[in-house]
């Protein structure tokens, strides 16, 4: 058993049929010694008396808020949460496996630039009695500071019969140099509590590997005389690291109709302009990627050909 | 500690092309190592990230773009002194700071070159003959060093009398390649910045 926060404790249980469970001793936070009784949750049934209460925690019915009283007055609370371990593996029931970029990916993180600021998000089908807390650091043995905000519900989607909820959090490395060469990864730890179930999820990454620039901005078209070609130009996104001659991007320019199966024109360039063939009912799209370290491409920025 | 704005004009900056070739060569070699050594811990997640130039050179700090010198987090650098007579410095007006930056890059390349050559000698003794260093990568390192053209003491190639542990050597190769790729990215950024300034 360990303390998650003040008066909240996590009991780690091997979860299998007829498991013996864990013996837990609760101590009432009071100078009083006599006349103390214990109850669980809203029940008035007295579980025991005395300054300490010894319980055998085997299942969720044994978890909850234990309260010690004296003469009708509440002295203190201890909330017990369960953390299940099945076949040596901690449960991951609360969050959905996003399966990208690989199986067992529960947390996904992205950074728009090298400033040390990043966003992580996760998915769940649970809508109520759910809380998250997020901690982060650079490295684990001698951790350097990363400050994370509160996790917030950022999107709701309907997936078949189920509703899916996306939560996200923003974090900022306390002293980040955009030009630095990372040798220690960022560690992100998310504590998830659903009712009386506790789970924790972690992700480890280098900022350089989670870079995904914003789409290029200010796309403009200029038709070329006596030709089907148009010159398309754009600018670096405002959120990208500066100077741009040091933090350079490369671009993919594509002309395509509404369907992915349609024919297309595609060209890659390090410049902020390109010449392509425009077709009726097609659109020109441009996306960006770090020129020197191939992490993710940005989303497309698009303008219609017409 | 930072790159000045007044730097060579693009036509006189031969190092950019060589640095692009360097990044390409090390990326290809790393990809080859990851494929060939698929049953070894050779991915970014599996290896320890070591920097053989740590406390010996200060490339990131010495080559910091002017715009980033206002960032306190970028300025906790180690001061190191270097020789300053490189041929990528296309004009005599080139500042001492830029010379310091380019000589730091030269020292990096020299250290990696020695490590890679020593390692290749060991890998050539491996009866499995599983992986060797790409000669193209070694040649590209050499070309960039020649373009930088700094006079520097020759570092003797390390020779080892004991029987090499090929498993450890291959893991060290992965560690070296990952670190060198990261440094090659920095070098490419620096050359691009100098070329544009």
């Amino acid at each position: 058993i360990w303390e998650l926060k003040k008066d909240v404790y996590v009991v780690e249980l091997d979860w299998y049929p007829d498991a013996p469970g864990e013996m837990v001793v609760l101590t009432c936070d009071t100078p009083e010694e006599d006349g103390i009784t214990w109850t669980l949750d809203q029940s008035s049934e007295v579980l025991g008396s005395g300054k300490t209460l010894t319980i055998q925690v085997k299942e969720f019915g044994d978890a909850g808020q234990y309260t010690c009283h004296k003469g009708g007055e509440v002295l203190s609370h201890s909330l017990l949460l369960l953390h299940k371990k099945e076949d040596g593996i901690w449960s991951t029931d609360i969050l959905k496996d996003q399966k990208e970029p690989k199986n067992k990916t529960f947390l996904r993180c992205e950074a728009k630039n090298y400033s040390g600021r990043f966003t992580c998000w996760w998915l769940t089908t649970i809508s109520t009695d759910l809380t998250f807390s997020v901690k982060s650091s650079r490295g684990s043995s001698d951790p350097q500071g990363v400050t994370c905000g509160a996790a917030t519900l950022s999107a709701e989607r309907v997936r078949g019969d189920n509703k899916e909820y996306e939560y996200s959090v923003e974090c900022q490395e306390d002293s980040a140099c955009p030009a630095a060469e990372e040798s220690l990864p960022i560690e992100v730890m998310v504590d998830a509590v659903h009712k009386l179930k506790y789970e924790n999820y972690t992700s480890s990454f280098f900022i350089r590997d989670i870079i995904k620039p914003d789409p290029p901005k200010n796309l403009q078209l200029k038709p070329l005389k006596n030709s089907r070609q148009v010159e398309v130009s754009w600018e670096y996104p405002d959120t990208w690291s500066t100077p741009h001659s040091y933090f350079s991007l490369t671009f993919c320019v594509q002309v395509q109709g509404k369907s992915k199966r349609e024919k297309k024109d595609r060209v890659f360039t390090d410049k902020t302009s390109a010449t392509v063939i425009c077709r009726k009912n097609a659109s020109i799209s441009v996306r960006a990627q770090d020129r020197y370290y191939s992490s993710s491409w940005s989303e497309w920025a698009s303008v219609p050909c017409s | 500690r930072n790159l000045p704005v007044a730097t060579p004009d693009p036509g006189m900056f031969p190092c950019l092309h060589h640095s692009q070739n360097l990044l390409r060569a090390v990326s290809n070699m790393l990809q080859k190592a990851r494929q060939t050594l698929e049953f070894y811990p050779c991915t970014s997640e599996e290896i320890d990230h070591e920097d053989i130039t740590k406390d010996k050179t200060s490339t990131v700090e010495a080559c910091l773009p002017l715009e980033l010198t206002k960032n306190e987090s970028c300025l906790n650098s180690r001061e190191t002194s270097f020789i300053t007579n490189g041929s990528c410095l296309a004009s005599r007006k080139t500042s001492f700071m830029m010379a310091l930056c380019l000589s730091s890059i030269y020292e990096d390349l020299k250290m990696y070159q020695v490590e890679f050559k020593t390692m290749n000698a060991k890998l050539l003794m491996d009866p499995k003959r599983q992986i060797f260093l790409d000669q193209n990568m070694l040649a590209v390192i050499d070309e960039l060093m020649q373009a930088l053209n700094f006079n520097s003491e020759t570092v003797p190639q390390k020779s080892s009398l004991e029987e090499p542990d090929f498993y450890k050597t291959k893991i060290k190769l992965c560690i070296l390649l990952h670190a060198f790729r990261i440094r090659a990215v920095t070098i490419d950024r620096v050359m691009s910045y100098l070329n544009a300034s």
């Epitope: 199966r261 024919k263 595609r266 890659f268 390090d270 077709r279 | -």
Partner: antibody
């Protein structure tokens, strides 16, 4: 199985024209760009131009502008390349090729030898 | 027009050995570079698109690398059916242009 089948070899006099055909099978004809290139004896490949069979849009290499005409007949899934004012330097193997991507070719025809000789 | 220069023009190789063909562009073309294989009397075949993207159905022994002006096609271990002529082609700008070709021959 996508295939491009070209018409047979031709012998032409200088100053005349030649029209080479390229019949496509497999896939929808108008879903692809169709290109023509050529290779003179002992020389490299030379791109001549493309057509979008869907709308008849064409673009030609400046070198051939005014002498080459590329057309397409959707009903027979056939593209044509006509080269006029032939000269001996036009002796070459002419290839058609296609792709959904405009700028490179994932399927090629077998080639048609055109000999220009007086 | 962008001039594409291949080297060597002829490459004698022993079967089972690796082979590398170089292609250089007269100006930077990013990764807009494609490789083809052609055998006498046969249709050409696309091997690699955009410098390094493998093509479905093409054996994994064919790989491409490069960007900017310098590109390489590598065949890791030459098989008897790989003896042919190889062409690079740039798609950075029109007119599209090809290299002169590299003939890979049995040593």
């Amino acid at each position: 199985q996508v295939q491009l089948v070209q018409s047979g070899a031709e012998v032409k006099k200088p100053g005349s024209s030649v029209k080479v055909s390229c019949k496509a099978s497999g896939g929808t004809f108008s879903d692809y760009y169709l290109h023509w290139s050529r290779q003179a004896p002992g020389q490299g490949l030379e791109w001549m131009g493309w057509i979008d069979p869907e709308n008849g849009d064409t673009e030609y290499a400046p070198k051939f502008q005014g002498r080459v005409t590329i057309t397409a007949d959707e009903s027979t899934s056939t593209a044509y390349m006509e080269l006029s004012s032939l000269r001996s330097e036009d002796t070459a193997v002419y290839y058609c090729a296609r792709n959904k991507e405009l700028r490179y070719f994932d399927v090629w025809g077998q080639g048609t030898l055109v000999t220009v000789s007086s | 027009d962008i001039v594409m220069t291949q080297s060597p023009l002829s490459l004698p190789v022993t079967p089972g050995e690796p082979a590398s063909i170089s292609c250089r562009a007269s100006q930077s073309i990013s990764i807009n570079l494609h490789w083809y294989q052609q055998k006498p009397g046969q249709a050409a075949r696309l091997l690699i698109a955009f410098a390094s993207q493998s093509i479905s159905g093409v054996p994994s022994r064919f790989s491409g690398s490069g960007s900017g002006t310098d590109f390489t096609l590598t065949i890791s271990s030459l098989q008897p059916e790989d003896f042919a002529t190889y062409y690079c082609q740039q798609s950075n700008s029109f007119p599209l242009t090809f290299g002169q070709g590299t003939k890979v021959e049995i040593k």
